[in-house]
Interface confidence: low
């Protein structure tokens, strides 16, 4: 019999994998090395994936050799003596200045340079650079980038205000709706701010006298309701209010004259006025009952080749009349008058001239106040510098207010360099059917005031007093103030505005840029102004917008539910 | 719910001295603006005086009749309002009331506490 | 200053009768704050904002106003009401009190 060859030789076993050949009767066997496994110790054993140890027990990564395996880590991690565990390498102390300008940030694994919001990170220049979010149109209706940020404006003087969101823009809202029904019968006595509302020219035969009929309505104290004059200039006749009494002024060849008489008629009713000339006087009528009765030598207006010819002013009179009056008189009138009867012709052409004329229509009803329609402001020069008071400047401002509308700036002091350092504004609240009072200085609210009802019935009374040191408010509200030592900042520029040239604007701004102050619009609404303890009377500005009326405050439309009807009593106006 | 809770009434002689307290609980003082209210036969419910809160600068405010004698004060950190009165009078007899000021003005009361200015 | 006249100054009535009392102030552009008073208890705040009431206060209890007067009327007295009754309006600086109208049971 033949002798059985060595099985293991040639070696059957995988020379990589095997550890021992035994050689057995027409058999062999393989030992395998660890990390192998088969008949042969041909195939390799993936420690990865030995579901009793996980991974191969490695943290991160494990790589399978053949016979073996290895642990190793992912980027930004080194690997722990024990071999199987990764450590986050911090990049940011390893490599100062990583990221220049920016802050570096160590993150696992890596790191990251970040910026301040409003910033964006410049790989080239390693340093933040501001991003221009204006340039991705990211506001509705105007866009002001500044470093690390932007702010979206809307044009309030458009009847526009910032939306919630901060970057549409929407109409600011009526609140209170009001009654501005007007009828042609009426004549608007203050259509315009400087200037004669209507003329007219009478050619009548010359036995022909003076007279004017006319119903009369007004809450103002002071102003001419109509003057006269002959063709020649020589003689003329002037019928004003002056401390809410009618006052008569007259200039002819003959004499030279001032009356004043009657009741107070600047209470808002309609009171009938008659002015006649008769033979040796002129008869002053109010309510058919004579008031003053002024002696005359001659006729008031000399009749010139069988005619008197007269002309006849509105609410006015002629620039250089001015000089003439016997007594000065602003002649500035917010009122009204109706049924008129000049020289006895009726009310002859005058329906038909103010009847296309929407602007030189009255109001039907009307309230005392100023009304301001939210399309122009008023300006005042007002010196605030108090010599007696140590702390030099002082602002004392009581407003009396009822809204229309819920967004809009009451009263601005504006720097002759376009800056607003001082202003108080309305704002739409958050809150529903509520407003914000907003003090600002420039475009920093220093004092919010939130979530009054202030679209009411009521009128609502609010009394601030500020000098360089100080912001007091004297109407018992819940306020939002910013800290004292940013308030005293803000004050602080304020002060250097008051010690310059400042000029007072009531019911909103004049063109400044829309970024100088938080609200822009227009205020819109009722509002009687103190400041310094004087009444702020509309006929008395430098300058006003001609929508503006003085002393007449258009009535609420309907009454709204009592629910929408409340103010927060604190503000109530019980003047 | 709100507490008001005043105490430091008494006797007195005209001329003296004597100090008021209210101390306050179940609202947010330091917010709050307070108030002495005052009731006697002769004068009826007469307000005295009011303190602001933190956001005013706790700013006082007094009745004429009282200016210049009486100090209104607080301790946000104890929730306690007092009523400094010098220079008493007779008229100024009377049950002071602390009270809370909201926006319905003297919202919430104290039960009150009695002062008798005599010889 | 305002000055409130509250009238009468006392009335009484009789269980299930109307009561109408009245407080003049000098401006009917104000809100008026009635506050009723029990002996040996603090005045309690009734009704705001000239016709609101407090809650807890009875439904017979309502106020108006008509010009600068204004009422505290209650549609049908119980015991419960009879009470001390004050006005109070803000005008600014000072807080006013109405005198007062003592109501009693007949």
């Known amino acids: 019999v033949n002798a059985i060859p060595d099985q293991c030789s040639p070696l059957p076993c995988n020379e990589d994998g095997y550890m021992s050949c035994k050689d057995g009767k027409a058999s062999f066997t393989c030992t395998c090395k660890p990390g192998w496994q088969g008949e042969k110790c041909e195939f390799d054993i993936n420690e990865c994936k030995d579901p009793s140890n996980i991974n191969g027990g490695c943290s991160q990564i494990c790589d399978n050799t053949p016979g073996s395996y290895h642990c190793s880590c992912k980027s930004g991690f080194v690997m722990l003596s024990n071999k199987k565990d990764c450590k986050d390498v911090d990049e940011c102390s390893l490599k100062p200045n990583m990221c220049g300008t920016a802050v570096c940030k160590n993150i696992p694994g890596d790191f990251e340079c970040e910026c301040p919001e409003g910033y964006r990170y410049n790989l080239k220049s390693k340093s933040c650079e501001d991003v221009d979010e204006c340039s991705e149109n990211m506001c509705a209706q105007l866009c002001v980038n500044y470093p690390g940020g932007y702010t979206c404006y809307c044009d309030g003087k458009k009847g526009f205000k910032l939306a919630q969101d901060q970057k549409s823009c929407e109409a600011v809202s009526v609140c209170l709706p009001l009654n501005l029904d007007t009828k042609y019968e009426l004549l608007y006595l203050a259509e315009q701010f400087a200037g004669v509302v209507l003329y007219l020219k009478f050619r009548l035969p010359e036995i022909s006298r003076f007279s004017a009929e006319f119903d009369f309505r007004t809450y103002d104290s002071q102003g001419v309701i109509l003057y006269a004059e002959s063709i020649d200039h020589s003689a003329w006749l002037l019928i004003a209010l002056r401390g809410g009494k009618i006052e008569v002024q007259l200039k002819n060849e003959h004499t030279s004259k001032i009356t004043t008489g009657g009741d107070i008629i600047n209470n808002g009713l309609w009171n009938m006025v008659s002015v006649e000339e008769l033979e040796h006087s002129i008869s002053i009528k109010i309510a058919k009952e004579a008031v003053m009765d002024i002696n005359k030598p001659g006729p008031l207006f000399k009749p010139e080749n069988g005619l008197l010819e007269t002309k006849v002013y509105f609410a006015g009179f002629p620039r250089k009349v001015e000089s003439e009056l016997i007594k000065p008189i602003n002649p500035r009138l917010d009122g009204c008058i109706r049924s008129w009867n000049l020289m006895k012709q009726g009310a002859s052409g005058i329906k038909e001239i103010i009847q296309e004329k929407q602007n030189k229509h009255c109001l039907v009803t009307v309230e005392k106040g100023s009304y301001y329609p939210g399309s122009g402001i008023a300006e005042f020069h007002i010196d605030y510098n108090n010599g007696s008071n140590a702390e030099g400047w002082h602002i004392n401002v009581t407003l009396n207010i009822r809204p229309s509308m819920g967004t809009g700036v009451m009263l601005a002091l504006v720097s002759s360099n376009n800056t607003v350092p001082f202003a108080v504004s309305l704002v739409d609240s958050t809150s529903e059917k509520s407003q914000d009072i907003v003090i600002s200085v420039e475009n920093t609210v220093i004092y919010r005031i939130q979530a009054l009802s202030l679209c009411s019935n009521q009128r609502s009374h609010l009394e601030f007093r500020v000098n360089r040191n100080n912001l007091e408010l004297l109407t018992p509200l819940k306020i939002e103030t910013i800290s004292q030592e940013e308030l005293q900042t803000q004050l602080a520029i304020l002060d250097k505005a008051m010690k310059g040239k400042v000029a007072t604007y009531l019911g909103g701004l004049p063109d400044v840029p829309f970024s100088a102050t938080p609200v822009n619009a227009f205020y819109n609404g009722c509002m009687e102004v103190n400041i310094n303890g004087v009444e702020l009377d509309l006929d008395e500005a430098i300058s006003k917008h001609n929508d503006i009326r003085a002393h007449s405050c258009p009535s609420v439309w309907k009454k709204t539910k009592n629910s929408e009807d409340q103010v927060d009593p604190r503000l109530i106006d019980g003047k | 719910e709100v507490k008001l809770e005043e105490s430091g009434g008494g006797l007195v002689q005209p001329g003296g001295s004597m100090k008021l307290s209210c101390a306050a609980s179940?609202?947010?003082?330091?917010?709050?603006?307070m108030g002495w209210v005052r009731q006697s036969p002769e004068k009826g419910l007469e307000w005295v005086a009011e303190?602001?809160?933190?956001?005013?600068?706790?700013?006082?405010y007094y009745s004429e009749s009282v200016k210049g004698r009486f100090t209104i004060s607080r301790d946000d950190s104890k929730s306690s309002v007092y009523l400094q009165m010098n220079s008493l009078r007779a008229e100024d007899t009377g049950i002071f009331y602390c009270?809370?000021?909201?926006?319905?003005?003297?919202?919430?009361w104290g039960q009150g506490t009695t002062l008798t200015v005599s010889s | 200053q305002i000055v409130l006249t509250q009238s009468p100054a006392i009335m009484s009535a009789s269980p299930g009768e109307k009561v109408t009392m009245t407080c003049s102030g000098r401006?009917?552009?104000?809100?008026m704050y009635w506050y009723q008073q029990k002996p040996g208890s603090p005045p309690r705040l009734w009704i705001y904002d000239t016709s609101n009431l407090v809650s807890g206060v009875p439904a017979r209890f309502s106020g108006s106003r008509s010009g600068t007067s204004y009422s505290l009327t209650i549609s049908s007295m119980e015991a419960e009401d009879a009470a001390t009754y004050y006005c109070q309006q803000f005008n600014g600086y000072p807080y006013t009190f109405g005198g007062g109208t003592k109501l009693e049971i007949r």
């Open positions: 401006s009917s552009e104000n809100y």
């Open positions: 179940g609202f947010t003082f330091s917010d709050a603006w």
């Open positions: 009270c809370l000021i909201t926006a319905f003005l003297f919202d919430y």
């Open positions: 303190i602001r809160g933190k956001a005013n600068n706790h700013a006082t």
